[in-house]
Interface confidence: low
C-alpha cells in the first residue's frame, strides 16, 4: 500500500522516548526495513540502533519481571523461615531460662556447681538445631556421663574418687540407670523433635536459596531475540496498538524459561516433604512439647538420681569396690528435697499451629511456581490480548497465532517455533539447584522417619540461609568422646543403649 510508505512514526517516537532513548534516532516516517535483524523486514519506524536498544531493553525488562516474581517468593520463604526459627529458638531459650530460674532453688549446689554443664548442653542443642554436624545421641550421652561423674562426686564428698574409680562408675551406669528413664526418653524424643525442626527450617532455607540462585541465571541471546519480537516488533512495524497473542507469549516464555521449568518435579517433592514433616510437630514427641520442656527431663533426672542415691551407691561399691575415705572431706551430703517438676506437657500456645497452617497454605500456593511462571509473566507483565482476539500480534503481523503451545521443560522445547533452544545443553546452575532440592527432600524424608542425617550445608557455594556451618571446629564429625586424658576411658555409658565409643578426642 503506497500510502503506508509515508506513514508517520509519531506513536513509536512517543514509546521510544518514554523508555529514555534519544528521539533523534527515530525516523520522521517509515523507512524500508532490510536492515532489521530481529523484526520482520517490512516497512518500519525502527533503525538498526533502535532495534538493538529495544532488544536490550526487552531482555532487561523480562529479567526484572522474573526477579520480581522470585523476590516475592523469596520474601515469603524468608518470612516463614524467620517465624519458625524464632519460635523454635524461643522454645529452647525459654526452657533454658526456666532451668536457670528454678534449678538453683530446687537443687542447690547440685545445680550451681554444674550450671555450666547444663548451659553447654543447651548450647549444643542450639548448635544441633542450627545444623551443626554433631551427633545428638552422643552429645546427650556425654552430657549424662559427665553429669553423673560430677554429681556422684558431690553427693559423696567424704569419698576419694580417683579417675579409675570414676571410669568404673561410668561403665556401671549403663546397667544402673542412675537418672531413671529421663535420659532414654529425652534421647528418643529430642532426636525426633530436633531433627524435624531443623530439617523443616533448613528446607525453607534451601528453597529460598534455590529461588535466589535461579533468578540470577541469565537469559540467553535466543531468548532476547524472541522477547524483542514479542514485545517491540509490533511498534517497529507500525502496529503499536496490537497486543501479543496469549499462546505466542507462552511459547516465547516457555522457551526462555525451559530450564527453570525443569525444577518443577523436585520443587514439588521438596514442598510436599516440608508439609508432611509438620505432622511431626505435634504430640508427646513433637517439637513444641519436647524443645520447650528439656528442663523438665533434666529435673526428673536429678530427682531420680537423688531418690536412687543409696541403692546406686551400694551397687557402685558392689561393682567397683570400696572407695577410700577422704580424711579432709565433709560428711555425706544431706538428702535433698526433690526439685518441683513443671508439667511436662507444655500447653500449646497456638503460635505453632498458626505458623504451620499459614505455611502449609503458602507452600501449596507456590507448588507450581516454576511451570506457571511463563503464564504468570505473560498475563501480568505482557499486556496480552484476549484469547478470542484474532487480530493480536503473532510475531509477524496482526492475526491469529496458529502454532500449538509447547509442553513444560527443556525436552519439550525441541520444536518451539519462537525460541531456538538447544535441548542437549541444560543450564548447569539450574541442574545444581535441582540436585540441592533432591538432597534436601531426602533429608526431610529421613527426618520424617525420625532419622538423623549428616547436616552439612546443602548450598553449593556456602551462601545458604543458615542451614549449617559444615564443620564446626570441635564439633566436626563427632564420633568420639570429649575426654582427652590418656588415663581415662570415654564416659559414654550413662545413656542406656549406647555402647562405649572407640578412640579419644583431644580437647
Amino acid at each position: 500500500d503506497p500510502a503506508s510508505k509515508s506513514r508517520s512514526c509519531g506513536e513509536v517516537r512517543q514509546i521510544y522516548g518514554a523508555k529514555g532513548f534519544s528521539l533523534s534516532d527515530v525516523p520522521q516516517a517509515e523507512i524500508s526495513g532490510e536492515h532489521l535483524r530481529i523484526c520482520p523486514q517490512g516497512y518500519t519506524c525502527c533503525t538498526s540502533e533502535m532495534e538493538e536498544n529495544l532488544a536490550n531493553r526487552s531482555h532487561a525488562e523480562l529479567e526484572t519481571a522474573l526477579r520480581d516474581s522470585s523476590r516475592v517468593l523469596q520474601a515469603m520463604l524468608a518470612t516463614q523461615l524467620r517465624s519458625f526459627d524464632d519460635h523454635f529458638q524461643h522454645l529452647l531459650n525459654d526452657s533454658e531460662r526456666t532451668l536457670q530460674a528454678t534449678f538453683p532453688g530446687a537443687f542447690g549446689e547440685l545445680y550451681t556447681q554444674n550450671a555450666r554443664a547444663f548451659r553447654d548442653l543447651y548450647s549444643e542443642l542450639r548448635l544441633y538445631y542450627r545444623g551443626a554436624n554433631l551427633h545428638l545421641e552422643e552429645t546427650l550421652a556425654e552430657f549424662w556421663a559427665r553429669l553423673l561423674e560430677r554429681l556422684f562426686k558431690q553427693l559423696h564428698p567424704q569419698l576419694l574418687l580417683p579417675d579409675d574409680y570414676l571410669d568404673c562408675l561410668g561403665k556401671q551406669a549403663e546397667a544402673l540407670r542412675p537418672f531413671g528413664e529421663a535420659p532414654r526418653e529425652l534421647r528418643l524424643r529430642a532426636t525426633r523433635a530436633f531433627v524435624a525442626a531443623r530439617s523443616f527450617v533448613q528446607g525453607l532455607g534451601v528453597a529460598s536459596d534455590v529461588v535466589r540462585k535461579v533468578a540470577q541465571v541469565p537469559l540467553g541471546p535466543e531468548c532476547s531475540r524472541a522477547v524483542m519480537k514479542l514485545v517491540y516488533c509490533a511498534h517497529c512495524l507500525g502496529v503499536p496498538g496490537a497486543r501479543p497473542c496469549p499462546d505466542y507469549c507462552r511459547n516465547v516464555l516457555k522457551g526462555c524459561l525451559a530450564n527453570q521449568a525443569d525444577l518443577d518435579a523436585e520443587w514439588r517433592n521438596l514442598l510436599d516433604s516440608m508439609v508432611l514433616i509438620t505432622d511431626k510437630f505435634w504430640g508427646t514427641s513433637g517439637v513444641e512439647s519436647v524443645i520447650g520442656s528439656v528442663h523438665t527431663w533434666l529435673a526428673e533426672a536429678i530427682n531420680a538420681l537423688q531418690d536412687n542415691r543409696d541403692t546406686l551407691t551400694a551397687k557402685v561399691i558392689q561393682g567397683c569396690g570400696n572407695p577410700k575415705v577422704n580424711p579432709q572431706g565433709p560428711g555425706p551430703e544431706e538428702k535433698r528435697r526433690r526439685g518441683k517438676l513443671a508439667p511436662r506437657e507444655r500447653p500449646p500456645s497456638g503460635t505453632l499451629e498458626k505458623l504451620v497452617s499459614e505455611a502449609k497454605a503458602q507452600l501449596r500456593d507456590v507448588q507450581d511456581f516454576w511451570i506457571s511462571l511463563p503464564g504468570t509473566l505473560c498475563s501480568e507483565k505482557m499486556a496480552l490480548s484476549t484469547a478470542s482476539d484474532d487480530r493480536c500480534w503473532n510475531g509477524m503481523a496482526r492475526g491469529r497465532y496458529l502454532p500449538e503451545v509447547m509442553g513444560d521443560g527443556l525436552a519439550n522445547q525441541i520444536n518451539n517455533p519462537e525460541v531456538e533452544v538447544d535441548i542437549t545443553k541444560p543450564d548447569m546452575t539450574i541442574r545444581q539447584q535441582i540436585m540441592q532440592l533432591k538432597i534436601m527432600t531426602n533429608r526431610l524424608r529421613s527426618a520424617y522417619n525420625g532419622n538423623d542425617v549428616d547436616f552439612q550445608d546443602a548450598s553449593d557455594d556456602g551462601s545458604g540461609s543458615g542451614s549449617g556451618d559444615g564443620c564446626l571446629d570441635d564439633l566436626c564429625s563427632r564420633k568420639v568422646s570429649r575426654k582427652s586424658s590418656s588415663s581415662r576411658t570415654p564416659l559414654t555409658h550413662a545413656l542406656p543403649g549406647l555402647s562405649e565409643q572407640e578412640g579419644q578426642k583431644t580437647s
Epitope: R126, R130, L472, D473, D474, R482, S485, S507
Partner: antibody, heavy 118, light 106 residues
Framework: EVQLQQSGPELVKPGASVKISCKAS????????MHWVKQSPEKSLEWIGE????????TYNQKFKAKATLTVDKSSSTAYIQLKSLTSEDSAVYYC???????????WGQGTLVTVSS | QIVLSQSPAIMSASPGEKVTMTCSAS?????MYWYQQKPGSSPRLLIY???NLASGVPVRFSGSGSGTSYSLTISRMEAEDAATYYC?????????FGAGTKLELK
Amino acid sequence: EVQLQQSGPELVKPGASVKISCKASGYSFTGYYMHWVKQSPEKSLEWIGEINPSTGDTTYNQKFKAKATLTVDKSSSTAYIQLKSLTSEDSAVYYCARERNYDRFAYWGQGTLVTVSS
Amino acid sequence: QIVLSQSPAIMSASPGEKVTMTCSASSSVSYMYWYQQKPGSSPRLLIYDTSNLASGVPVRFSGSGSGTSYSLTISRMEAEDAATYYCQQWSSYPLTFGAGTKLELK
C-alpha cells in the same frame, strides 16, 4: 579454623568511652558464649563478663557492671565491649575469649590495648 | 568471690629440672584450669578440668589437686616453657584468675 580478631589499640581521654570489637570466624558464632577479660600489670587477669550470642543474655562481674556493656551483632559474627567513664585504672589489654564446651577458654583474641591518658 | 593465690610469684628452673607451682583457692572449687602466657601473646589453655591436657600441649605438663589445693607440674623444664602461668576457676561467679607464677629459665 577458629579465629577471634580484635580491633586495634585505642588511646582515649579520661571520661570518654571506647568500644572494642571481636570478630569471630571459623565456627557458629551463636553456638558459644563469648567472654571478656582485662589484663593490667597491677591486677593480672580479671574476668569482666560473658554474653550468649544467641540470646544476648549477659552475666557481669559485679566490679565491672557499671563500667562495661557487652553486645553482639549476629549478622557480622562480632562481639563488642563498651567501656565508659574511662580513668587511668582502665588502661589495660582487653581480651575476648570464646568458651569451648565444658568450661574452658580454648580460644582467645589477640588483645586490644586501651590507654587512657589526657 | 573465690580468691586464687598462686605460689611462688616468681621462680626459675634449669632445663631438664622438674617444676611445680601451686594454686590455693579461698573456698572449695570443683575443677581448676591453667593457662600459659608469654610476653606479647594471649593466654593459652594448658590444662582443663584439673588434669586434662588441652590440644597440642606437651605431655611434660600435668595438673592435679582437689578442693582448695591444686598444682601444675612440668616434668622436665624446657627453654620454651619460660612464661607466666595462671590458674582459673569456673565453680562460681565471678570467674577468677590467680595473680600468676612467673617461670624463668635459669
